[in-house]
């Protein structure tokens, strides 16, 4: 708490300007009117206040708006935003994308702070869903944003928003998240032709089921090994050697380098060695000729 003291004669602030950096903390408390500060918040950003001085200014705003700041003030907080706690931010009602952008700009280049995470959460909840413009904005500032959401949160992303997603935005997504995003991407890109469709859907294929991979194998897509290695193991296992060959096209030669890694390793174990040999890559570990392949999952379903 800053002690209440009378403002010295002639020091009452008529406007928020650079002369205030020469005020001591108690002078700022005594001489700056909170309502004046609220209406001239945009000027604070251009003034090199110390952190201690910013504490005083924040205290004045807190007293003026105990229930939370109005958006007109929030939009112009500038670097005073860095002084806000998640508890402060939970009191806000941020509805304008411009306000969100202004505050994300302040934190640009830094890791997502608890304040920013709370701000985004408040904003998205207020909107009811993660629309395209919001997603555009968030992934521009935080490419990993999408992958920080739970599968439940991702379920509120409308398919139309998927157009805003760039491949790098999905780099840190795990299979559970891609399981949610893939069907949305499939819906979003459904009217595109073969090659264009593949370019767009490629980053989401970590959530694709076997049937969709089989369908892609009929379209000469030439999937690269990096994409293949991110596919769900359970989706890859039922693919035949011929289907994998068609799916990868000229990239099929890359299987040799990956034969000890999932999903390639597990897929090899499910193929007949005869079939693997047709690839001419020297892949070993397939089912020897003359052995009977039992589909145990099918047997369990029947019993």
């Amino acid at each position: 708490e800053v002690e209440k003291t009378a403002c010295p004669s002639g020091k009452k602030a008529r406007e928020i300007d650079e002369s205030l950096i020469f005020y001591k903390k108690w002078e700022l408390e005594a001489c700056v009117d909170a309502a004046l500060l609220a209406t001239q918040m945009d000027r604070v950003n251009a003034i090199p206040f110390t952190y201690e001085q910013l504490d005083v200014l924040k205290h004045k705003l807190d007293e003026l708006y105990p229930q939370g700041y109005p958006e007109s003030v929030i939009q112009h907080l500038g670097y005073l935003f860095l002084k806000m706690s998640p508890e402060d931010i939970r009191k806000w009602n941020v509805t304008s994308l411009e306000t969100l952008k202004a505050l994300l700009e302040v934190n640009k280049g830094h890791e997502m702070s608890p304040q920013v995470a709370t701000l985004i959460d408040r904003f998205v909840k207020g909107r009811g869903q993660l629309d395209k413009d919001t997603l555009d904005t968030l992934t521009a500032f935080y490419p990993g944003y999408l992958c920080s959401l739970s599968p439940e949160e991702l379920s509120s992303v409308p398919p139309s928003s998927i157009w805003a997603v760039r491949p790098q935005d999905l780099d840190t997504c795990d299979p559970r998240q891609l399981d949610v995003l893939y069907p949305k991407a499939r819906l979003a890109f459904q009217n595109m032709n073969g090659s264009e469709y593949f370019v767009k859907i490629q980053s989401f294929l970590g959530g694709a089921p076997t049937e969709d991979l089989k369908a892609l194998s009929q379209q000469n897509v030439s999937m690269d090994l990096a994409t293949f290695m991110k596919l769900r193991t359970d989706a890859v296992l039922p693919l035949t050697v011929a289907e994998v060959q068609k799916l990868l096209g000229p990239h099929v030669e890359g299987l040799k380098a990956e034969e000890r890694h999932r999903p390639v390793r597990d897929w090899i174990l499910r193929q007949r060695q005869d079939d693997l040999d047709t690839l001419g890559l020297g892949l070993q570990g397939g089912i020897p000729n003359g052995y009977l392949v039992l589909d145990l999952s099918m047997q369990e379903a029947l019993s």
Epitope: D17, A46, I47, P48, Y79, E105, K108
Partner: nanobody, 114 residues
Amino acid sequence: QVQLVESGGGLVQAGGSLRLSCAASTTSSINSMSWYRQAQGKQREPVAVITDRGSTSYADSVKGRFTISRDNAKNTVYLQMNSLKPEDTAIYTCHVIADWRGYWGQGTQVTVSS
């Protein structure tokens, strides 16, 4: 990141003048540029500030003697110090706010001998 390079400090007789300069290398828009000083055993204090609008303000102790100015094209701020006194002896450091972040220079020593 904003890199700040100060120059112009040195040893001067009381009553003499010095001109400090601070060049900021950045593509960001600069909001304000200011000079602070810290005398030995004392806290750092603001000396002068100039905003992006060109308005200036000074500490009472230097009013009428020091002038702050900036060259926006060169992203440089200057501090013209006249009628220097021994109590002006300190390390003078440049401070810049660019895109809502504050950056400090390394500081330049100013020594005023009586």
